[in-house]
Interface confidence: medium
């Protein structure tokens, strides 16, 4: 039983897996996806130069890295025909100025001074075709992908913003690059790292 799938025109849909993008191009700074620094990977291009007010002799100690991350976009049972590649922001934007903060018997540390983070600076929109099983027609989506990273001072806007997840599924990394695990929202479908097949 063969079913032929016809290509449909690009449309913008509101759904849990993707975010509507009004038009292609660059966008002002939206709420960032803050990465948990459990794993540190080397930057492929070294990232952009750090933007921070701290004075230091060795800038190499901290930098805002742009790591390439390849993943599939998913929406329910549907998945993008091809993986998309975007940047994941990682790195330290200033020297570790930490003060002891005793909580109970454990030793906790909290940062001192302005809180600068390596967060997305620019975004790009990409049109993606999602293939759906069971004879369902393909879906078209516009997804917002991180295009560059920058060290920025966190504001209330950043701190109070809900962390967004665009329902993406990690794909096998490009040669010589290792992906970092991303923070997933509860809304996102149960995306798992892809097996290398």
């Amino acid at each position: 039983h063969h079913h032929h799938h016809h290509h449909q025109g690009w449309q913008a849909f509101k759904n849990d897996a993707t975010e509507i993008i009004p038009e292609l191009g660059e966008y002002p700074e939206p709420p960032p996806e803050l990465e948990n620094n459990k794993t540190m990977n080397r930057a492929e291009n070294g990232g952009r130069p750090p933007h921070h007010p701290f004075e230091t002799k060795d800038v190499s100690e901290y930098s805002c890295r742009e790591l390439h991350f390849t993943r599939y976009v998913t929406d329910g049972p549907c998945r993008s025909a091809k993986p998309v590649t975007e940047l994941v922001c990682s790195g330290q934007c200033g020297p570790a100025r930490l003060l002891p903060n005793a909580i109970g018997r454990g030793k906790w540390w909290r940062p001192s001074g302005p809180d600068f983070r390596c967060i997305p600076d620019r975004y790009r929109a990409q049109r993606v075709q999602l293939l759906c099983p069971g004879g369902e027609a393909p879906r078209a989506r516009k997804v917002r992908l991180v295009a560059s990273c920058k060290c920025k001072r966190l504001t209330r806007f950043h701190n109070q913003s809900e962390l967004k997840d665009f329902g993406t599924e990690a794909a096998r990394p490009q040669k010589g690059r290792k992906p970092r695990p991303r923070a997933r929202s509860a809304k996102a479908n149960q995306a798992e790292l892809e097996n290398a097949y």
Partner: nanobody, 120 residues
């Protein structure tokens, strides 16, 4: 030619469990999605659960928390573990396989279906 062979259906009491299996044979491309759909008498075929070769899964709201889909890529087999079955789960369950080549669908295959009846 690809063939899908389903098994595991049957009669079960409400609250019981069943495990469906679907084995695919033939020339199957590695980038694929396998899933289960069901059709009750007088109703349209509906999605139950799907799983991509990459591991991405999706479930119909009506079965979330009760059904679990899994697969064995080496055997080209997909499983559907159905727990806490309800009378409304009664239907013919169909296995589906779709494969992707160079970013487009290469094929879309269906099994013959296996009957699941939940009744006391």
């Amino acid at each position: 030619e690809v063939q899908l062979v389903e098994s595991g259906g049957g009669l079960v009491q409400p609250g019981g469990s069943l495990r469906l299996s679907c084995a695919a044979s033939g020339s199957i491309f590695s980038d694929n999605v396998m899933g289960w759909y069901r059709q009750a008498p007088g109703k349209q075929r509906e999605l139950v659960a799907t799983i991509w070769s990459s591991g991405h899964t999706n479930y119909a709201d009506s079965v979330k928390g009760r059904f679990t889909i899994s697969r064995d890529n080496a055997k080209n087999t997909v499983y559907l573990q159905m727990n806490s079955l309800k009378p409304e789960d009664t239907a013919v369950y169909y296995c589906n396989l779709g494969t992707i080549v160079t970013g487009t669908w290469r094929s879309d295959y269906w099994g013959q279906g296996t009957q699941v009846t939940v009744s006391s």
